[in-house]
């Protein structure tokens, strides 16, 4: 009674050994083909022929400028990406048999997509706008309008809005208000008044002196009584230090835009970049 099941068990073992159950799944780095598990080809190699009962999987290295980056059963390697210099691209990292070439954009350009298949020039922020965020290899320049108190007079992909010059801190006054495209123009205190008043004062003084001389010459009658020796009329000399000319603090006048600009003593005679433009 015991023999029959035992024979069945033995026969079952023998049958299993001769005809193994076809695997439904294979181990990692293997693949199922013709009811058997074959080894996958390693990265950098492609499949030439599947394994058999008697032979291993046959793989071949990828050719030049080709790659496969995973364990695979591909019969063809992938071509390396071409970083087309005519699309603003350059090679960031060369490809190997196991990795693709990585492209990036030339300086001043950024990728048009995540795959970085082409590039476009960074946008410049026009006058009146400043750079809020400088462009990167993957994002464009972000511009913002210059708020009140700030200006930008150039088209640039790097320049932020600059604050207006503070005339007060330089003991100067605002002569021309700033805009979002121009800086304020500073000048010395009461400059315009001084430019008008000084010549008038000089003129008046000169006229008074001429009148006085004329009166002295004409109105003075000759007399015989002369207890003191007769004094010759004194020649009038106009000294260098008349009111309005200050020897202690010489003034340098610079013609700028056909307007005399008074340069304060002790400060360098340097016209700002803004004024030169």
């Amino acid at each position: 009674m015991v023999r029959l099941p035992l024979q069945c068990v033995l026969w079952g073992c023998l049958l299993t050994a001769v005809h193994p159950e076809p695997p439904t799944a294979c181990r990692e780095k293997q693949y199922l083909i013709n009811s058997q598990c074959c080894s996958l080809c390693q990265p950098g190699q492609k499949l030439v022929s599947d394994c058999t009962e008697f032979t291993e999987t046959e793989c071949l290295p990828c050719g030049e400028s080709e790659f496969l980056d995973t364990w695979n059963r591909e019969t063809h390697c992938h071509q390396h990406k071409y970083c087309d210099p005519n699309l603003g691209l350059r090679v960031q990292q060369k490809g190997t048999s196991e990795t693709d070439t990585i492209c990036t954009c030339e300086e001043g350009w950024h990728c048009t997509s995540e795959a970085c298949e082409s590039c476009v020039l960074h946008r410049s922020c026009s006058p009146g706008f400043g750079v809020k965020q400088i462009a990167t290899g993957v994002s464009d320049t972000i511009c913002e309008p210059c708020p009140v108190g700030f200006f930008s007079n150039v088209s640039s992909a790097f320049e932020k809005c600059h604050p207006w010059t503070s005339c007060e801190t330089k003991d100067l006054v605002v002569q021309q208000a700033g805009t979002n495209k121009t800086d304020v123009v500073c000048g010395p205190q009461d400059r315009l008044r001084a430019l008008v008043v000084i010549p008038i004062i000089f003129g008046i003084l000169f006229a008074i002196l001429l009148v006085l001389v004329f009166i002295k010459k004409v109105a003075k009658k000759p007399t015989n009584k002369a207890p003191h020796p007769k004094q010759e009329p004194q020649e009038i000399n106009f000294p260098d230090d008349l009111p309005g000319s200050n020897t202690a603090a010489p003034v340098q006048e610079t013609l700028h835009g056909c307007q005399p600009v008074t340069q304060e003593d002790g400060k360098e005679s340097r016209i700002s970049v803004q004024e030169r433009q």
Partner: antibody, heavy 117, light 106 residues
């Protein structure tokens, strides 16, 4: 077979203009970027300009910017180089070439440009 | 600006190996191409993408590129290999050529 045939060279006075042509055959012209390369007498090769396959992008060596202009007519499979305000230093043998994997694989026979008064 | 530097001349005996170098800052990060030019002829591409050979170019021509130097190697040099050789690479969207090397087969 794949070939590039050039024409348009000659002798020209300084300040004058010249237009070089490069006729392509044997390949799909519109699928390739194209170059102009020059070689002064007894000197080495100097890259001059490139134009992308659709003509939307072009670039030049600094010494010719603003004077030389590369263009193409894909319907006629032809590449051009318009040369204005020519200088004696532009005297050279000019080659057109096909762009290929960071290099240039097909070259024209060359055309001579002489700038002299 | 970027520059590619080549020796003006290299001499080799027939059957020997000739090596022509091309140096440039971090050239190994760029792809180098090599051209052969014989007198009165147009240049011919012999190596592209550092080490790839166009069809029709003999196997004796090979290339490598690492660090700051790209090298063109001609093994078993023949008299017909006597010519000028130029390296070329891209920088800032412009193509650049080396000054050229005259290979003399003694």
């Amino acid at each position: 077979q794949v070939q590039l045939v050039q024409s348009g060279g000659g002798v020209v006075q300084p300040g004058r203009s010249l237009r070089l042509s490069c006729a392509a055959s044997g390949f799909t012209f519109s699928s390739y970027a194209m170059h102009w390369v020059r070689q002064a007498p007894g000197k080495g090769l100097e890259w001059v300009a490139v134009i992308s396959k659709d003509g939307s992008y072009e670039n030049y060596v600094d010494s010719v910017k603003g004077r030389l202009a590369i263009s193409r007519d894909n319907s006629k499979n032809t590449l051009f180089l318009q040369m204005d305000s020519l200088r004696p230093e532009d005297t050279a043998l000019y080659f057109c070439a096909r762009d290929y994997w960071y290099g240039m694989d097909v070259w024209g026979q060359g055309t001579t440009v002489t700038v002299s008064s | 600006s970027y520059e590619l530097t080549q020796p003006p001349s290299v001499s080799v005996s027939p059957g020997q190996t000739a090596s022509i170098t091309c140096s440039g800052d971090k050239l190994g990060n760029k792809y180098a191409s090599w051209y052969q030019q014989k007198p009165g002829q147009s240049p011919v591409l012999v190596i592209f993408q550092d080490s790839r050979r166009p069809s029709g170019i003999p196997e004796r021509f090979s290339g490598s590129n690492s660090g700051n130097t790209a090298t063109l190697t001609i093994s078993g040099t023949q008299a017909m290999d006597e010519a000028d050789y130029y390296c070329q690479a891209w920088d800032s969207s412009t193509a650049l050529f080396g000054g050229g090397t005259k290979l003399t087969v003694l």
